[in-house]
């Protein structure tokens, strides 16, 4: 039975040209996290495997940095980066958990940043 829940940064906004940290946290389960995949709609951004390390999709290698932790840092944001992002937690023995983050990239310099999510 899957008992875990994923907490995410939720809906966040950031300025064009800036950077943002995408983070998720899996709680309420003792399942072992084996891998986290970061995806944007139909695209794979990155994979963080607990043992093998990071894979960064070549399409994003100049604008994506691994971490902190299992999170992902998006840099040099453009308005085209606006959209849904998913953290897909592969766990054993539970299976797969998915979290959703909506990022809005604003032209204006008055973009309000969502509260940064901290993993305790």
């Amino acid at each position: 039975m899957m008992t875990g829940t994923i907490e995410t940064t939720g809906n966040i906004s950031a300025e064009k040209g800036g950077s943002i940290i995408l983070q998720c946290h899996l709680s309420s389960t003792t399942a072992q996290v084996t891998q986290v995949n970061w995806e944007q709609q139909d695209q794979l951004l990155a994979i963080c495997n607990a043992d093998l390390g990071w894979h960064i999709s070549p399409s994003f290698k100049d604008r994506v940095a691994p971490g902190p932790g299992l999170g992902l840092t998006l840099q040099s944001l453009t308005v085209n980066d606006t959209g849904e992002y998913f953290c897909i937690y592969h766990t054993y023995p539970d299976g797969t958990y998915t979290g959703r983050i909506f990022l809005e990239v604003l032209e204006s310099s008055v973009a309000e940043h969502g509260a940064r999510f901290q993993i305790p």
Epitope: Q35, E39, L44, L52, H55, P58, K61, H90
Partner: antibody
């Protein structure tokens, strides 16, 4: 230039163990993950597992758990794969390969080590 | 485990032919697919990574495409040195898995 040089062919009896080595040169060994892939005669490729050379963390395919052990010796930039309780269907060419920096494809491969299991 | 199914398993072609090999994943793997070439008695060589990126030094006649569950390796004009076996591999999730291979033979 990048090179992965594997140890020589082995002939083993069923139930025995084999340890294959893979000596790396031409790159910073601890910045990469080393993988092992095998190929039975006339068959396709099968991933056994990988090991992060910096931290020594290994990930083994469930099929080989309990039989395969991956290790590294950072001081001599060498990766090892030990397979125990050998069976005749473990007869194969065993390759070590390096996964690219921040990528999960296998960009350099060793020349292969033939392991024959026969009574 | 994710199954990677290649087709055809073998094909005969002539020098100069356009050759297409397909690989179908049993589930969505986004673009986490690589293609390798293997000649008899030799280790595989990386051709294409992340579905469509040509690896360093690989001739431009090789190209990869696809995302999700369907992927294609194309050789635009087959050369004598291209007769070999080709494998796809997914790394979307472990265990990493390979297709069964496609042998390209001389017609």
């Amino acid at each position: 230039q990048v090179q992965l040089v594997q140890s020589g062919a082995e002939v083993k009896k069923p139930g025995a163990s084999v340890k294959v080595s893979c000596k790396a040169s031409g790159f910073t060994f601890t910045e990469y993950t080393m993988h092992w892939v095998r190929q039975a005669p006339g068959q396709g490729l099968e991933w056994i597992g990988g090991i992060n050379a910096k931290f020594g963390r290994q990930l083994i395919h469930q099929k080989f758990k309990g039989r395969a052990t991956l290790t590294v010796d950072k001081s001599i930039s060498t990766a090892y794969m030990e397979l125990s309780r050998l069976r005749s269907d473990d007869t194969a060419v065993y390759y070590c390969a390096r996964s690219s920096y921040y990528r999960f494809d296998l960009d350099y491969w060793g020349q292969g080590t033939t392991v024959t299991v026969s009574s | 485990d994710i199954q990677m199914t290649q087709s055809p398993s073998s094909l005969s072609a002539s020098v100069g032919d356009r050759v297409t090999i397909t690989c179908k994943a049993s589930q969505d793997v986004k673009t986490a697919v690589a293609w390798y070439q293997q000649k008899p008695g030799k280790a595989p060589k990386l051709l294409i990574y992340s579905a469509s990126f040509r690896y360093t030094g690989v001739p431009s006649r090789f190209s990869g495409s696809g995302s999700g569950a369907d992927f294609t390796l194309t050789i635009s004009s087959l050369q004598p040195e291209d007769f070999a076996t080709y494998y796809c591999q997914q790394h979307y999730t472990t265990p990493w898995t390979f297709g069964q291979g496609t042998k390209v033979e001389i017609k």
